[in-house]
């Protein structure tokens, strides 16, 4: 079954899918599709990487971490409700049927409409709970609802893991991760 | 320590090619994608190609496919770049360089000395 | 190809003042930019990959920040022998493509 993703229309989703190169530079080619993982390849592919780069992409897909270490977690900018459905990373590892194939699901939700404020109200009330992290881009903020499902009693935990590191990295074990060697 | 020295400079006259070696030392040549950039006088850097040494593959930009060949010699660790139908325009000093991450994913990035390719008539 | 895009293409600042440049990818790149400085009759030196990792025996007064499309280049307090001209270079999809350079100089 899936893992689910979730963001909010305007926002940009992330769906994390690693692996680790045997060894440095030994990179492996991945793709990622719109639609479940077929038998071969990936139908409708929206981004692809070969042993040296990025080498096909669409408008709005592209990778923010580091895919020469064997980041290869997708972003996808500005998402719509027509985004939502299942994704397939597919890490292309050499010989027959050695792939390593992950469906991952994105749900978007509508943007929250925020009635205009008024005197007295509280201000959190009236905006989405935002974990920043660094090393995302300018200004970049993933809400809440981005994350896979989590509980809120493990938000303050969360929050203080995500203050120094990579959101990519704190949430690798909610994600695609594959071993290559 | 990693060196790369590259051959010595050259004329040629238009229409001409010319072939431009860089030889490396230092670290495990057959593991990291040879570059060849460009950097015509008073210009900005331009990227030609790489090659790859353990397997002789090959990426070359677009604007150079038609008259760049890369070639590697792994018994010297000698990289080649040939550039045929040689034009003024492609006066410049020729740089051959190597990056990307080495053990430990450490960032490696060394460059040859260049090598003023002039094509006067 | 992705273009970059960088400014200023030059500018004049006094030792020790905040030099500042930026780097715009017609597409986004994620981390993949790297800075190099040239000085007159040398060879490009790396500072800076990955956006903000600084190259081996690099001053620390150099660093690099941005992720995606934008991308900014800082020596914190200039250097006389910081005077040279600068490229960002992106690594994301071949071919590998520079900057036109920002030369810097001291007033």
């Known amino acids: 079954s899936e893992v689910e993703y979730r963001a909010e229309v305007g926002q940009n989703a992330y769906l994390p899918c690693f692996y680790t190169p045997a060894a440095p530079g030994n990179l492996v080619p991945v793709c990622w599709g719109k639609g479940a993982c077929p038998v071969f390849e990936c139908g409708n592919v929206v981004l692809r990487t070969d042993e040296r780069d990025v080498n096909y992409w669409t408008s709005r897909y592209w990778l923010n971490g580091d895919f020469r270490k064997g980041d290869v977690s997708l972003t996808i900018e500005n998402v719509t409700l027509a985004d939502s459905g299942i994704y397939c990373c597919r890490i292309q590892i050499p010989g027959i049927m050695n792939d390593e194939k992950f469906n991952l699901k994105l749900v978007i939700k509508p943007a929250k409409v925020t009635p205009a404020p008024t005197r007295q109200r509280d201000f959190t009330a009236a905006f989405p709970r935002m974990l920043t992290t660094r090393g995302h881009g300018p200004a970049e903020t993933q809400t809440l609802g981005s994350l896979p499902d989590i509980n809120l009693t493990q938000i303050s935990t969360l929050a203080n893991e995500l203050r120094d590191s990579r959101l990519a990295n704190d949430l690798r074990d909610s994600g695609a991760t594959i071993r290559i060697g | 320590q990693v060196q790369l020295v590259q051959s010595g400079a050259e004329v040629k006259k238009p229409g001409a090619s010319v072939k431009v070696s860089c030889k490396a030392s230092?670290?495990?040549?057959?593991?990291?994608?040879m570059n060849w950039v460009r950097q015509a006088p008073g210009q900005g850097l331009e990227w030609i190609g790489d090659?790859?040494?353990?397997?002789?593959?090959?990426k070359y930009n677009q604007k150079f496919k038609d008259r760049v060949t890369m070639t590697t010699d792994t018994s010297t660790s000698t990289a080649y770049m040939e550039l045929r139908s040689l034009r003024s325009d492609d006066t410049a000093v020729y740089y051959c360089?190597?990056?990307?991450?080495?053990?430990?994913?450490?960032?490696?990035?060394?460059w040859g000395q260049g090598t003023l390719v002039t094509v006067s008539s | 190809d992705i273009q970059m895009t960088q400014s200023p293409s030059s500018l004049s600042a006094s030792v020790g003042d905040r030099v500042t440049i930026t780097c715009l990818a017609s597409?986004?790149?994620?981390?993949?930019l790297a800075w190099y400085q040239q000085k007159p009759g040398k060879s490009p030196k790396l500072l800076i990959y990955?956006?903000?990792s600084l190259a081996d025996g690099v001053p620390s007064r150099f660093s690099g920040s941005g992720s995606g499309t934008d991308f900014t280049f800082t020596i914190s307090s200039l250097q006389p022998e910081d005077i040279a001209t600068y490229y960002c270079?992106?690594?994301?999809?071949?071919?590998?493509?520079f900057g036109g350079g920002t030369k810097v100089e001291i007033k």
């Open positions: 360089a190597t990056w990307g991450y080495g053990s430990s994913y450490r960032w490696f990035d060394y």
């Open positions: 230092g670290y495990t040549f057959t593991d990291y994608y």
């Open positions: 090659i790859i040494p353990n397997n002789g593959g090959s």
């Open positions: 597409q986004p790149i994620g981390i993949w």
């Open positions: 990955a956006a903000t």
């Open positions: 270079q992106q690594l994301y999809s071949s071919p590998w493509t």
